[in-house]
């Protein structure tokens, strides 16, 4: 697994413990919480990152304050169960035996139940809408420049194949990034749109998951793009199953 060999760190995930104890003294990195070996040449799965976050040092919460323009939204933080590949298990339960089904990005997609609840398969989130509102600027950003910059960001920073960035919409001050990735489209080695969206969300909050990189310094033609609100919507290949009671509440 690719890790920075000289000082044995994981460039793509700072929530890891790395040691030169791999084969032949090679640097090997394991995710906090799960202890699973991670591939430091690509993004770590959201499930392993959430699990790591639950067991990270308290300093990770007290010393990293969300950036001034990041609204603290409901993170949906819980200690998830991940499968051997690092993906979310379809059924998640808490310590009090309350269970629910999740999609591939770990978001609840059914009502909560007990241990008898069945989640037959992990339903794929194939469409993610990232809604951003930027801080006021002298004028609107040029749409094509903004589009190019955000596509470059997802390609270079998150290693997401450009074909999965379906569209970038802009109506000042709102930006909407559409990520699409069907099961059939995702080849081995492709970064998952859910993982890319999670890294982006943490970057926007000033809580970068990358080792040794500051937060995002997003610029469009030299003009800083500062995000003051983020909302992320997830659409699954199979619609979620919530009771009408919840939908009318």
């Amino acid at each position: 697994h690719t890790a920075a060999q000289d000082n044995c760190t994981c460039p793509t995930n700072k929530m890891t413990v790395c040691s030169p104890d791999g084969p032949g003294g090679r640097c090997q990195c394991r995710a906090l919480g799960s202890g699973m070996a991670v591939d430091c040449s690509t993004l770590t799965s959201k499930c392993l990152l959430l699990k790591a976050r639950m067991s990270a040092p308290k300093n990770a919460r007290t010393l990293v304050r969300p950036s001034e323009h990041a609204l603290v939204d409901n993170d949906g933080l819980y200690d998830p169960d991940c499968d051997p590949e690092g993906r979310f298990k379809a059924r998640q339960c808490n310590q009090t035996s309350v269970c629910w089904c999740v999609n591939s990005v770990g978001v609840r997609r059914t009502d909560k139940g007990d241990l008898s609840l069945r989640c037959d398969e992990l339903v794929r989130t194939h469409h993610i809408l990232i809604d951003l509102r930027h801080r006021p600027t002298a004028g609107a950003f040029n749409h094509s420049d903004l589009d190019a910059e955000l596509r470059r960001l997802f390609r270079e920073r998150y290693r997401l194949h450009p074909k999965f960035v379906a569209a970038v919409h802009y109506e000042q001050p709102t930006i909407q990034i559409e990520l699409r990735q069907n099961t059939s489209q995702k080849a081995a080695g492709d970064v998952d749109i859910g993982d890319a969206a999670y890294y982006f969300e943490r970057d926007i909050k000033g809580e970068s998951l990358f080792q040794g990189r500051g937060g995002l310094d997003l610029r469009v033609r030299g003009e800083p793009l500062q995000v003051e609100r983020t909302l992320i919507y997830y659409l699954d290949e199979i619609p979620p199953k919530f009771s009408m009671k919840r939908l009318t509440a």
Epitope: N7, C10, V17, S55, K58, N59, T62, S208, G212, G215
Partner: antibody, heavy 118, light 106 residues
């Protein structure tokens, strides 16, 4: 190769202030936290405070609150520690240390001796 | 604030001896403990992080173990160049060093 280079030794009178610098090179400056650690003569190591160069946020040990101010100049990849109202007990070697991803200190400066004497 | 109690404060051993230093935290710090070697006039050097993970380039005679509140640092076969003061550091909730253990050759 990561390097933290600190400013030279200082001799100050009681009541004065001193500003020690720590210049980082060899890695992304804003991607790591920076800490200051004190070692008084014949004593152990004491953590003073931390700064996140990306946002400029600081957190201080309760013991050094009001005594120390940590600042950053991102343009020169330099972190500063200012000690005010100096007293003889501030005589020590002060180290800057980089916080790794999980915050333990992986690289250290060479140390700066501050002597407070009338 | 978390207190770290390190013992012994000083220790005399012969070359080739097995040396053990302990550190006790006043509350659970998971495995967020590092060990440093400090020689006079030199900056501290990171030996071990996350309780037992050897920093790159550090000889394998150094090791660490423990979890929660009780931690141990071991030098399996003392070498002359190991003469130094050793410190533990908890980095779970802010940062606290142990008082240090001065290691001398008999």
């Amino acid at each position: 190769q990561v390097q933290l280079v600190q400013s030279g030794a200082e001799v100050k009178k009681p009541g004065a202030s001193v500003k020690v610098s720590c210049k980082a090179s060899g890695s992304s400056f804003t991607g790591y936290t920076m800490n200051w650690v004190k070692q008084a003569p014949g004593q152990g190591l004491e953590w003073i405070g931390i700064i996140n160069p990306y946002q400029g946020d600081t957190t201080y040990s309760q013991k050094f609150q009001g005594k120390v101010t940590i600042t950053v100049d991102k343009s020169t990849s330099t972190v500063y520690m200012e000690l005010s109202s100096l007293r003889s007990e501030d005589t020590a070697v002060y180290y800057c240390a980089r916080g790794a991803g999980l915050y333990y200190f992986d690289y250290w400066g060479q140390g700066t001796t501050v002597t407070v004497s009338s | 604030d978390i207190q770290m109690t390190q013992s012994p404060s000083s220790l005399s051993a012969s070359v080739g001896d097995r040396v053990t230093i302990t550190c006790q935290a006043s509350q659970d710090i998971n495995k967020y403990l590092a060990w440093y070697q400090k020689k006079p006039g030199k900056a501290p050097k990171l030996l071990i992080h996350y309780t037992s993970n050897l920093q790159t380039g550090v000889p394998s005679r150094f090791s660490g173990s423990g979890s929660g509140t009780d931690f141990t640092f071991t030098i399996s076969s003392l070498q002359p160049e190991d003469i130094a003061t050793y410190y533990c550091l908890q980095y779970d909730d802010l940062f606290t060093f142990g008082q240090g253990t001065k290691l001398e050759i008999k």
